[in-house]
Interface confidence: low
């Protein structure tokens, strides 16, 4: 809890947890009780802290920009809004989470830029022939999906250095000379056709392409992907369009340090290096990009990669695609015969998914997502919706929290993969107390200026201690804090400041007394309740509340339940103890000792019943029932009965016989007569 966190300053208090607040009211606690200032707002109010002195900054969201999502076709593509809100500030209390909702809607008829990046190594000769009319066919198909489509073309082979190419003058000039066949010298990447809506121009360009060759199977395609992604102006990528990069190859690609074989050791810099002829000028200088570098640049430039690769390479490129946001893989026929359908399918797959990605300064920040997809279905810990139709809205609950109090704000971008739209999020920690702005330096409230007063407490200068800095280091003797010389200081339950005990806070209750020797929780318990819940614990003893008594306060002083029907306490046969009768008379029982078959003369009162029973025979015995009723008794012939608590009777009969019997009591207090017998009867006179 807040109060047990030991916070001595407002800022320390807020750091305990988002539920904690600080009371900056000047005389809120006794001087020693600094720790009591840190508690939940409700507890502080209950303790008497005025609302305007409670420091409790709350996490909050301030929306800076929230244009509505675009619906339907937009005249101007720069007006398209596909994510809402677009910009906000998130002020977070450390440890406290804040959830905001992000909505994404892929607008209808969104412009598409498609750059066709083709491997022109010798094995792709048949593919070049197949795609001679691709431009017009692709434009025709894409016009069904968007009214604003542009195509571009580039090609790649390999870094033109040994050992990737042969280096004899003849083979540098014609790497296919050994076939024999003429092909172009090996090149890294050529950007041939900037994005255009002129499909015939694309066809023309493709018809003019010639293949090239190299030695090893992997090609330099990743160099080409990097340049196609980052050379935004030269390629012609628009700001407000879907950027598709179709990578067509029948071979694996080199990446990262593969170029060390050729002595190239300068890491790829992720910058555009196209010369005046639009060729990659750093092919023989920079390493291939790593997968990580490619991911960064593709994401940064919203480029969605479509790997169109042959059967042997599909598995390999699927592994790459798993790492690259928004990348898809299509199976290319040997001669690229299915490239048109592959592109259309990949486009439709991309448009059926909305996935969020997070960029920026997220280290140490906890971000969790819940996707709310078609029909409002919730997907916990997911930031992707699939099987969406264009025009559907996907929503995402984004929960953010920061674990601790940093001094910096963070800039984060949440954006749909492949779309230019983004939510800009400024996350700033909310852990300053307003009261810290108002500092009284060398304050008179801190014992002759021995400290600064802020947030209701003193921050003491070096060499001074105590709630009001009243204690110098020379006054730190603890003798006066001990109840006896051999006892621990402040009974081990407090701190000795300036010869006075400041008792610790306890989760169980209050510790007090000049030596912290007392508390209000170390008393006896009755039924698990302190002082039977009928008294207060004061320094180890129960002080019973009115109406209760006893060591445990479990004994009521009320005698109401002891009064019998005739108004006499315990029927005059016992004492009322703790609200219950303790019967003193032998044979007396019942809640008010009202049952007592043995009280008075129990034997003689049964005489008429007994004598009737002895003198009557057969049917006449029925007459005795009434007599016995009057005597409050019944006669039992049973021999098996409990003799505990029974009364033994002897009566002198009319015929001088001695009658003996036993009386017991049933549960209702009625008498039952057992074992009736006559003995010592005088013999009748012997008259002959």
């Amino acid at each position: 809890g807040c109060a047990l966190g030991g916070a001595e300053t407002c800022e320390d208090c807020l750091l305990i947890g988002p539920q904690c607040a600080w009371c900056a009211q000047e005389n809120f606690t006794r001087p020693s009780g600094v720790g009591e200032r840190c508690d939940t707002p409700a507890n502080l109010l209950a303790k008497g802290c005025q609302l305007n002195f409670i420091e409790n900054p709350v996490s909050q969201v301030e929306i800076l920009k929230n244009k509505p999502l675009s619906v339907g076709r937009q005249k101007n593509s720069s007006d398209i809004v596909q994510i809402a809100p677009q910009s906000l500030i998130l002020k977070l209390r450390p440890g406290g989470a804040q959830t905001l909702q992000v909505h994404v809607r892929q607008t209808e008829d969104y412009p598409v830029d498609l750059y066709y990046l083709m491997d022109l190594s010798a094995s792709m000769d048949d593919d070049l022939n197949t795609i001679k009319e691709l431009g017009s066919r692709l434009s025709k198909e894409m016009s069904k999906l968007t009214s604003n489509f542009r195509l571009g073309f580039g090609s790649f082979v390999e870094k033109p250095v040994s050992p990737f190419v042969k280096t004899t003058p003849e083979e540098i000039a014609n790497p296919c000379s050994s076939i024999p066949y003429f092909c172009l010298p090996t090149f890294g990447f050529k950007h041939i056709l900037p994005l255009t809506n002129d499909a015939e121009r694309f066809n023309e360009i493709v018809k003019n392409q010639k293949i090239s060759a190299n030695i090893d199977t992997p090609e330099g395609g990743f160099d080409a992907i990097m340049q196609a992604a980052v050379c935004k102006e030269k390629i012609g990528w628009r700001n407000d369009s879907l950027h598709l990069l179709v990578f067509v190859s029948d071979a694996d690609s080199h990446f990262g340090m593969d170029s060390k074989l050729a002595g190239i050791v300068i890491p790829n810099d992720g910058l555009c290096h196209l010369d005046s002829k639009n060729e990659y000028s750093m092919s023989t200088v920079l390493e291939y990009p790593t997968i990580g570098q490619l991911i960064d640049k593709l994401v940064q430039n919203n480029v969605l990669l479509i790997f169109a690769v042959t059967q042997e390479q599909v598995h390999l490129y699927e592994n790459y695609a798993k790492l690259i946001p928004g990348a898809t893989v299509g199976l290319l026929q040997k001669d690229s015969g299915n490239i048109l359908q592959l592109i259309i399918s990949a486009y439709e797959e991309l448009r059926s998914e909305v996935e969020l990605e997070v960029l920026g300064d997220t280290e140490g920040l906890n971000l969790s997502f819940t996707a709310i997809c078609n029909n409002g279905t919730f997907f916990q810990h997911q930031k992707k919706c699939s099987h969406m139709k264009v025009g559907d809205t996907a929503s995402f609950n984004v929960t953010v929290n920061i674990p601790n109090c940093e001094r910096r704000s963070r800039h984060i971008i949440i954006k749909p993969v492949g779309l230019g739209d983004a939510l800009e999020l400024l996350v700033s920690p909310e852990c300053n107390c307003d009261c810290q702005k108002e500092v009284e330096v060398n304050s008179s409230k801190c014992h002759h200026g021995n400290g600064s007063f802020q947030c209701g407490v003193c921050a003491c200068h070096p060499g001074h201690m105590g709630p009001r800095c009243e204690c110098g280091e020379d006054m730190l003797s603890t003798d006066s804090c001990k109840e006896a010389p051999d006892h621990p200081s402040c009974s081990g339950r407090g701190d000795c400041y300036c010869g006075q005990c400041i008792c610790h806070l306890s989760p169980y209750g209050n510790i007090y007394g000049p030596y912290c020797q007392c508390d209000n929780f170390s008393c006896v318990r009755h039924k698990g309740l302190l002082c039977g819940d009928n008294g207060d614990c004061d320094c180890g003893e129960c002080v019973c509340r009115s109406g209760w008594t006893g060591e445990y306060c479990n004994c009521t002083t009320s005698t109401d339940s002891c009064v019998s029907e005739d108004g006499v306490l315990c029927s005059g046969r016992g004492d009322c103890v703790c609200g219950k009768c303790v019967c003193a008379n032998p044979g007396a029982s019942g809640p008010t000792c009202e049952r007592c078959p043995t009280c008075g003369d129990p034997c003689n009162s049964k005489r008429s019943c007994i004598e009737c029973h002895l003198s009557a025979a057969g049917q006449a015995r029925e007459e005795c029932v009434d007599k016995c009723k009057l005597a409050g008794a019944t006669i039992s012939e049973e021999e098996d009965f409990s003799k505990d608590g029974s009364v033994s009777c002897s009566l002198q009969g009319e015929n001088e016989c001695l009658i003996t019997f036993l009386i017991t009591t049933d549960n209702e207090g009625k008498s039952i007569i057992h074992s009736i017998s006559e003995k010592d009867c005088p013999k009748p006179p012997n008259i002959p």
């Epitope: 301030e62 929230n66 244009k67 509505p68 500030i89 804040q98 959830t99 909505h103 307003d434």
Partner: antibody, heavy 128, light 113 residues
Framework: QVQLQESGPGLVKPSQTLSLTCTVS??????????WSWIRQHPGKGLEWIGY???????YYNPSLKSRVTISVDTSKNQFSLKLSSVTAADTAMYYC????????????????????WGQGTTVTVSS | DIVMTQTPLSLSVTPGQPASIFCKSS???????????LCWYLQKPGQPPQLLIY???NRFSGVPDRFSGSGSGTDFTLKISRVEAEDVGVYYC??????????FGQGTKVEIK
């Protein structure tokens, strides 16, 4: 409950800067979710939104006035202020301050009330 | 910018009779959270405006139930079921969707016949 009160000179000379202050009472200007706004109304005309400020200091201005407007906030005094530079007779109007509870996200939801608390307004005349 | 257009610009009503004021926005005020951010204000003579209705149809606290709002998307209506003398003044609609801008309609003046 929250009340707003505008204050400032009723007469300003052309080309000078108009300065108004709005004092918030009955509540804290630092309460989240509120945008503290200035609106004006030319004689016999409709309402024109000038701009607003969030307690953190973020400001938003009407594009048509943006080059001349500055809105600031002083949380310690529970006040926010308007400065309009290079005034002309066209700036003669009744100036209102208001509390605008605009769309603001929190707990996965948005809430919106509009301008729920207004000051009584102060008349400003621009004349030499 | 979103443009708010109100009709009619003035309205003369007999006490006890109903009245309707219309407001049209240049683009939909339906937000991505499913709420529509439009509100109505009344400015009585010599007073500041007061909030009547928010989010198209929600009456603000203290507003009599003879005032009701309806509409969706771009077209909205404020209805007064039985006009009373104290209802005279200028009524404004305002959009609240395109943060950070707040724009009002040009106002509808309501007077008693």
């Amino acid at each position: 409950q929250v009340q707003l009160q505008e204050s400032g000179p009723g007469l300003v000379k052309p080309s000078q800067t108009l300065s108004l202050t709005c004092t918030v009472s009955g509540g804290s200007i630092s309460s989240g979710g509120y945008y503290w706004s200035w609106i004006r109304q030319h004689p016999g005309k409709g309402l024109e939104w000038i701009g607003y400020i969030y307690y953190s200091g973020s400001t938003y201005y009407n594009p048509s006035l943006k080059s001349r407007v500055t809105i600031s906030v002083d949380t310690s005094k529970n006040q926010f202020s308007l400065k309009l530079s290079s005034v002309t007779a066209a700036d003669t109007a009744m100036y209102y301050c208001a509390r605008y509870r605009g769309p603001a996200a929190g707990r996965g939801d948005f809430y919106y009330f509009g301008m729920d608390v207004w000051g009584q307004g102060t008349t400003v005349t621009v004349s030499s | 910018d979103i443009v708010m257009t109100q009709t009619p610009l003035s309205l003369s009503v007999t006490p006890g009779q109903p009245a309707s004021i219309f407001c049209k926005s240049s683009q939909s005020l339906l937000n991505s959270d499913g709420k529509t951010y439009l509100c109505w204000y009344l400015q009585k003579p010599g007073q500041p405006p007061q909030l009547l209705i928010y989010e198209v149809s929600n009456r603000f606290s203290g507003v009599p139930d003879r005032f009701s709002g309806s509409g969706s998307g771009t077209d909205f209506t404020l209805k007064i079921s039985r006009v009373e003398a104290e209802d005279v003044g200028v009524y404004y609609c305002m959009q609240g969707i395109q943060l950070p801008w707040a724009f009002f309609g040009q106002g509808t003046k309501v007077e008693i016949k």
